[in-house]
């Protein structure tokens, strides 16, 4: 099946994806749209009042006016200058600033907490199944199976540290070799990048915002997938990661040290442990084929237990099992021995919500999944709103310049490497790459950080999470120290290798181009984002898993033709864009294939048919929620509400003149300014820091 041309045209013709650029409402103000009759909170204003300088003729004549969607929106200041304010206004402004900062930190806190709870929810829903993936004996011989198990388990438990710790304990117990563990670690690296992709989906309301956010999130996915694509075969052929890490581990005489520092967890744990507490050992025990663990609940009930050591008489199969003859005896039938048995006495119950409900893990998981996704979504919306109101004027200019500007020549190339270090440092502080990249996603969406800058930050985040793992390994008990350190180092060198492959030379920064291409497609066909998520994180890994279980012949039999077709399509695509003359006329484009095989349009029509009935009710709900939010946080009355609904009302693909559309901007105030309708702000609601 040929690729959709949208991906190919991602860079040369961005306007093609800018729905707003190709479809616009009639310029004459429509009375029905002039004022919003249903919203009494909104001041009646004209939606678009284009001044002569922005006439359609001019825009058609000057195609340069159509913005590159990847250019950051100009977050212009619409507030009164600090110098122009009176004392009361200045005090009010300061308090507003403090209020916004407190709100921002509050929502950020709950955002991080909801990510933690989301991980717990996924573990409750899919943790036991994930544990069983590990107990598959074929992992040893099939690196591809190891890889997809790493992906699936991490996706199911929403935590690469959980899957990594299972691998560590399995290696320590000799159930797994380091060689077999490496592909699992690579898979875990891929699986962990799903979190920020889910977070990006929350910004689906605004096309341009979603384009940037989704591309910013998937740059992580593409980096991991591409790294695996190159490094897994290299590792299988040379075992370089295993050899290098073995040498490092053997060259040091480690003493297990202090516990790895819990930095962000110190703040979030008091809250998240009131929601739910899990017994993570259960998943590891299932992975290690412990039959008793399969019936255990993951929800922790007893938090304070007293472990007592006592000597007990236990039966042994034969005298050979006796530590010494004097410690064994018989009752005439069975052979008995004395063993030190530890028994746990439950003292105090945990203090979380679900402790007394005795619900099955799946039920608790589903409840938490829904709640955490709602909280995550709500917090994200609020963070974006607050940041949108804070990041204006000089503040925005300073932040954007600081983050996105390169060092002066000849040190410009160093900027990216500094960003890698910043990403690593920040991840080390928050102790989670998911948290860091998820926090980065909305910033990319609203246009504070460019994808080009987000990329090295994300790569740094990958490094940061491995340094945390190395620290945790150094703090592990003697019996697991070597294996956990070697695995952590494998993870570290895998990410370093990936960075060396896909970062130093600008030409090799394929993940950026691929992410932008996907961002463009997803902005035009928003359902494709979910489609991508399902295919790359569930369907492909599950298919490979299934084929691997069927054995090598089946895997090769299915895999080779698929890989061959993909390579063929890629080569053809390359020739079409670079030197089409080489190809016969028929192969110079994809028109020889049915439309559904080279365009998303027919698929879009089918999906729209199914989702159509659900869009309007969802919209009303969206509007109401948005209005409540606006009232609660004191947004300006002009704040843009339910952008997704606006798009719906404007029609999915209305034919029109390619004029500058508000979708390319970040909020309506800005679009008005660009169109010349600058309105004096209400000093009660708008405030600029500088």
């Amino acid at each position: 099946m040929a690729p959709w041309p949208e991906l190919g045209d991602a860079q040369p013709n961005p306007s093609k994806y800018l729905e707003g650029a190709t479809s616009q409402q009639p310029i004459t103000p429509d009375k029905s749209k002039e004022t919003n009759k249903t919203d009494n909170t909104e001041v009646p204003v004209t939606k678009f009042e284009l001044l002569p300088t922005y006439s359609t003729a001019t825009l058609i004549e000057e195609p340069t006016e159509v913005d590159d969607p990847w250019n950051l929106p100009t977050l212009q200041d619409s507030g009164i200058k600090w110098s122009e304010r009176d004392a009361k206004g200045k005090i009010l402004c300061v308090f507003q600033g403090i209020g916004r900062l407190i709100l921002l930190l509050g929502f950020l806190y709950f955002f991080v907490c909801s990510l933690d709870v989301l991980s717990s929810a996924f573990q409750l829903v899919g943790g036991k199944m994930a544990g069983q993936f590990f107990s598959n004996s074929s992992i040893m011989s099939n690196p591809l199976l190891g890889l997809v198990i790493g992906v699936l388990v991490t996706v199911f438990v929403q935590s690469s540290s959980t899957s990594t710790s299972i691998v560590v304990s399995m290696v320590a117990s000799s159930l797994l070799t380091v060689r077999a563990a490496i592909p699992i670690i690579m898979g875990a690296n891929i699986g962990t990048s799903i979190t920020n992709t889910i977070v990006a989906l929350m910004q689906v309301g605004d096309r341009s915002e979603f384009r940037r956010a989704f591309a910013g999130a998937t740059v992580h996915d593409f980096f991991n997938w591409l790294s695996v694509l190159v490094l897994l075969p290299v590792e299988v052929a040379t075992h370089y990661l295993e050899v290098v890490t073995q040498l490092i581990v053997e060259s040091f005489h480690f003493k297990n040290g202090e516990d790895a520092p819990d930095l962000l967890k110190v703040i979030t744990k008091p809250f998240t442990k009131l929601i739910v507490q899990l017994d993570k050992k259960v998943i590891s025990q299932i992975a290690m084929n412990d039959e008793t663990a399969k019936n255990k609940s993951l929800v922790k009930i007893w938090c304070k237990t007293f472990t007592n050591m006592t000597q007990m008489n236990v039966t042994v199969p034969s005298m050979a099992n006796c530590t010494s003859p004097s410690l064994c005896w018989t009752d005439g039938i069975q052979i008995w021995t004395m063993k030190n048995v530890t028994y746990k006495e439950n003292i105090a119950k945990c203090q979380h919500i679900f402790v007394n409900f005795h619900l099955p893990d799946l039920a608790v998981g589903i409840i938490l999944l829904i709640i955490s996704l709602l909280v995550l979504c709500g917090c994200l919306i609020m963070i974006v709103k607050i940041l949108g109101s804070v990041l204006k004027g000089q503040v925005a200019t300073v932040i954007k310049k600081t983050i996105n500007t390169d060092f002066p020549f000849p040190f410009a190339w160093l900027t990216g490497y500094l960003a890698i270090l910043v990403g690593a440092g920040m991840t080390f502080i928050v102790q989670s790459s998911s948290v860091f990249t998820s926090a980065l996603t909305p910033l990319i969406g609203i246009g504070v950080i460019t994808i080009e800058r987000a990329y090295p930050l994300t790569l740094g985040s990958n490094i940061g999470t491995t340094t945390t793992a190395i620290l945790a390994a150094l703090a592990s008990p003697g019996n697991t120290l070597r294996s956990s350190l070697q695995i952590a180092l494998c993870h570290f060198f895998f990410n370093i290798s990936g960075i060396l492959l896909w970062y130093p030379i600008p030409f090799t920064r394929l993940p950026i181009r691929m992410a932008k291409g996907l961002g463009n497609i997803s902005a035009k066909y928003r359902w494709f984002a979910i489609f991508y998520l399902i295919i790359f994180f569930f369907l492909i890994p599950l298919t490979v898993f299934g084929l691997s279980l069927a054995g090598w012949p089946v895997l090769v039999g299915v895999g080779v033709p698929v890989v061959f077709i993909i390579i063929l399509v890629l080569c053809l695509r390359l020739l079409q864009s670079r030197c089409p003359r080489v190809l016969p006329k028929k192969l110079q484009n994809w028109n020889f294939l049915p439309l559904c095989m080279h365009s998303l349009k027919p698929w879009d029509a089918v999906i729209s048919k199914f989702t159509g009935p659900f869009q309007m009710p969802c919209c009303c709900c969206c509007r109401v929620c948005c209005r409540v939010c606006c009232l609660l946080c004191g947004c300006p009355k002009c704040c843009r509400c339910s952008k997704c609904c606006q798009d719906l009302e404007e029609g999915q693909e209305a034919q029109g003149v390619p004029v500058k559309a508000p979708e390319t901007f970040d909020n309506i105030t800005i679009s008005r300014e660009a169109q010349g309708e600058v309105r004096a702000p209400d000093s009660k609601t708008e405030c600029t820091a500088l």
Partner: antibody
Framework: QVQLVQSGAEVKKPGASVKVSCKTS????????MHWVRQAPGQGLEWIGA????????SYNQKFKGRVTMTADTSTSTVYMELSSLRSEDTAVYYC?????????????WGQGTLVTVSS | DIQMTQSPSSLSASVGDRVTITCKAS??????VAWYQQKPGKVPKLLIY???TRHTGVPSRFSGSGSGTDFTLTISSLQPEDVATYYC?????????FGGGTKVEIK
Amino acid sequence: QVQLVQSGAEVKKPGASVKVSCKTSGYTFITYNMHWVRQAPGQGLEWIGAIYPGSGDTSYNQKFKGRVTMTADTSTSTVYMELSSLRSEDTAVYYCSISTIITTGAVDYWGQGTLVTVSS
Amino acid sequence: DIQMTQSPSSLSASVGDRVTITCKASQDVGTAVAWYQQKPGKVPKLLIYWTSTRHTGVPSRFSGSGSGTDFTLTISSLQPEDVATYYCQQYSRIPLTFGGGTKVEIK
């Protein structure tokens, strides 16, 4: 109280088989191991084997293996010990006994004994 | 099989005397040793198990000691009712084995 009542004395010809029964009462039958011990006239004690009535698991002295069979009937709380291919040296008093001291082979309750005489 | 060798095979002592019977195991049996008393024409009666633990109802004049291969039954003050044959038994290995017995008489 715990009681072990054995079947009466038996006189058997060499090569024949003897089946001695031991009816129990006063305790939960399936709880304790039942041991069989014999004592030849004027001689010491010799352990034949044991059975756990709860599962029917048995353990025999190698000396008697192939000749001895122990069974338990939970419906009547009775244990049986059958010794085949009798020889004159099998003439002895056969005791059934139980060990209420769990996990040990020290027997604390004994039946009254059954004299088995093997003579031609 | 583990052999349990008892000595002496018989002994005669006066009432109130301290009587010691020894039992030697052919291999290490830990502390899995029991002592029995069998009066003439009666069934054996358990006196001691786990080398030194007195069974219920056994007078305190009976005591046991030892570990590994050497074990001792001591009657601190011989009484007329103590006239009997005493057997040691190991329950460390199957088959359970008994000593040859020690006949105690009163002078």
